[in-house]
Amino acid sequence: IPVIEPSVPELVVKPGATVTLRCVGNGSVEWDGPPSPHWTLYSDGSSSILSTNNATFQNTGTYRCTEPGDPLGGSAAIHLYVKDPARPWNVLAQEVVVFEDQDALLPCLLTDPVLEAGVSLVRVRGRPLMRHTNYSFSPWHGFTIHRAKFIQSQDYQCSALMGGRKVMSISIRLKVQKVIPGPPALTLVPAELVRIRGEAAQIVCSASSVDVNFDVFLQHNNTKLAIPQQSDFHNNRYQKVLTLNLDQVDFQHAGNYSCVASNVQGKHSTSMFFRVVESAYLNLSSEQNLIQEVTVGEGLNLKVMVEAYPGLQGFNWTYLGPFSDHQPEPKLANATTKDTYRHTFTLSLPRLKPSEAGRYSFLARNPGGWRALTFELTLRYPPEVSVIWTFINGSGTLLCAASGYPQPNVTWLQCSGHTDRCDEAQVLQVWDDPYPEVLSQEPFHKVTVQSLLTVETLEHNQTYECRAHNSVGSGSWAFIPISAGAHTHPPDEFLFTP
């Protein structure tokens, strides 16, 4: 670390005095201090001498000696006071620029440490400081206004009490700049616009910033529009607004509109699209298939997207049958607006019951007319099975009826013993019926099929099982003959048990 001679922290001299400051280090050393006249600098290897034969109040300040080659960057300092009875202040700068919330140092250096007790900071022409101005004083550095605000951008003077009267410094102008976080904030309203030819339209482009220095313009398809600008200041922000009013829109007004604002930090732009149409429109669509299949007991949400201008005058979900005349609950219908001209309507069917299969229609109306979108909802059912013993053309026949959706497949099993359900170990024979007769196949209903198994003689210690399955599940019915008679016995002689 360099050493300064004289080895005191501060030195007080009178004007005209000779001052010699010597700095010695291990290597070459350098002096740094306030810019002032009459100093002579002499360097000799590891020492440097700063001297003047005629000290003035302008030499007041802190002189620091550094050793550039020192990796630790050590330095030494001495503060020099040149106490001039006529000039209590040495002002190092007459303009100070800071950003809001920074500390602002007003560099009026006191030339006589004795005067410290009577110093104060005032605004020019003797005006007091603004309320809430928080400041401190250092005789070596001057006055510091802490966390300066934009409103404190003023001209200040430093005041010292000398012989009962206040002596002012020359003025220091403080400029507190707003912290501009970036380019101005923009809004372009509306985000999207549709009008029928001949209607009126308004597009508003507005920009705001903490600083007044910014520009804003509106352009249509890359052409800058000449629009009068309205300016305002509120919520501590400057606002500039451009309003484009079109009394009767035509197709040439359609296209892309961009709102562009710029300042020193850069440029922001936002765009919207203006569509001019010949007449009202109403379009319904769905991302879902209009033919839906859901397993009974499960839930389904039907969604319709609506694009419309002008806005909807009415809309509703309607159940068109075929099972009942009850309509969907309003609370199960939900509407969400994606934007001004696009909406999504959802019908929630949380636990589908057999009577809720059928057609669901979404209807909407605007000045362009009515539109409808219809969903067809078919429910899937696991098969339900029953078996009876009957005679067909004199032959004993087991008749299996299976109903479900999708259409069930039928398999017959014959197994040993009496059982509710044949397992693999008991199975004696298996017959697949690839083409069971379809008894009924109406839209939205279960498909009922019938399969016949001709049995010449019913074996009494055996079980005949009809098993039906589809994509939802399977069902079966076990037929157990309980009679000692021959195959010609009427059906009520036999017991069929589930």
Partner: antibody
Framework: QVQLQQWGAGLLKPSETLSLTCAVY????????WSWIRQPPGKGLEWIGE???????NYNPSLKSRVTISGDTSKNQFSLKLSSVTAADTAVYYC?????????WGQGTMVTVSS | EIVLTQSPGTLSLSPGERATLSCRAS???????LAWYQQKPGQAPRLLIY???SRATGIPDRFSGSGSGTDFTLTISRLEPEDFAVYYC?????????FGQGTKLEIK
């Protein structure tokens, strides 16, 4: 076509656990919701709870702390367990299928709780 | 929970007469998910009407249901001897599913 057949212990002591099973015949447990309902002697019907094929359950809040309903799709069966029974749980217990309301019912099992 | 109140508690009529049974809900029944059941001594209940007005499979057309919201009615247009039983209404629109206390239809 579809029939529900139920079984289980008919006589219990207080604090024991009631256990009933319901089998689905001629159809499948793989869709619909399946419920348990009870009816105290000479009184009205009370819904106990339900289960679907994926095992999702829903219980009557008045019994929720004591009820467990479980299902076995491979056997086409579902079961009811009611713990810590008292005399107030004496009732005929029914299993039922919910399609449009409770369209198919079991034959009922009389359960008596007595010390 | 939704409380269902049936009236009258007992209805005494003769075969051939018209029976009107009422069921009132403490709050609106979702999507008219209201059912009517018939129960005879020693038997399980039998579904008559679902969705407030739809007849279940195999139910004679002398049975009809009507109503929405909180007020529902079961009508038997011409009583047959086998119709004398206890009738329950039930809502299955919101959990817990609840039944009315029942209306006993007896022979006068």
């Amino acid at each position: 076509q579809v029939q529900l057949q139920q079984w289980g212990a008919g006589l219990l002591k207080p604090s024991e656990t009631l256990s009933l099973t319901c089998a689905v015949y001629g159809g499948s447990f793989s869709a619909y919701y399946w419920s348990w309902i009870r009816q105290p002697p000479g009184k009205g019907l009370e819904w106990i709870g339900e289960i679907n094929h994926s095992g999702s359950t829903n219980y009557n809040p008045s019994l929720k702390s004591r009820v467990t309903i479980s299902g076995d799709t491979s056997k086409n069966q579902f079961s009811l367990k009611l713990s810590s029974v008292t005399a107030a749980d004496t009732a005929v217990y029914y299993c039922a299928r919910e399609a449009d309301a409770f369209d198919i019912w079991g034959q009922g099992t009389m359960v008596t709780v007595s010390s | 929970e939704i409380v269902l109140t049936q009236s009258p508690g007992t209805l005494s009529l003769s075969p051939g007469e018209r029976a009107t049974l009422s069921c009132r809900a403490s709050q609106s029944v979702s999507s008219s998910y209201l059912a009517w059941y018939q129960q005879k001594p020693g038997q399980a209940p039998r579904l008559l009407i679902y969705g407030a007005s739809s007849r279940a499979t195999g139910i004679p057309d002398r049975f009809s249901g009507s109503g929405s919201g909180t007020d529902f009615t079961l009508t038997i247009s011409r009583l047959e001897p086998e119709d004398f039983a206890v009738y329950y209404c039930q809502q299955y629109g919101s959990s817990p599913y609840t039944f009315g206390q029942g209306t006993k239809l007896e022979i006068k």
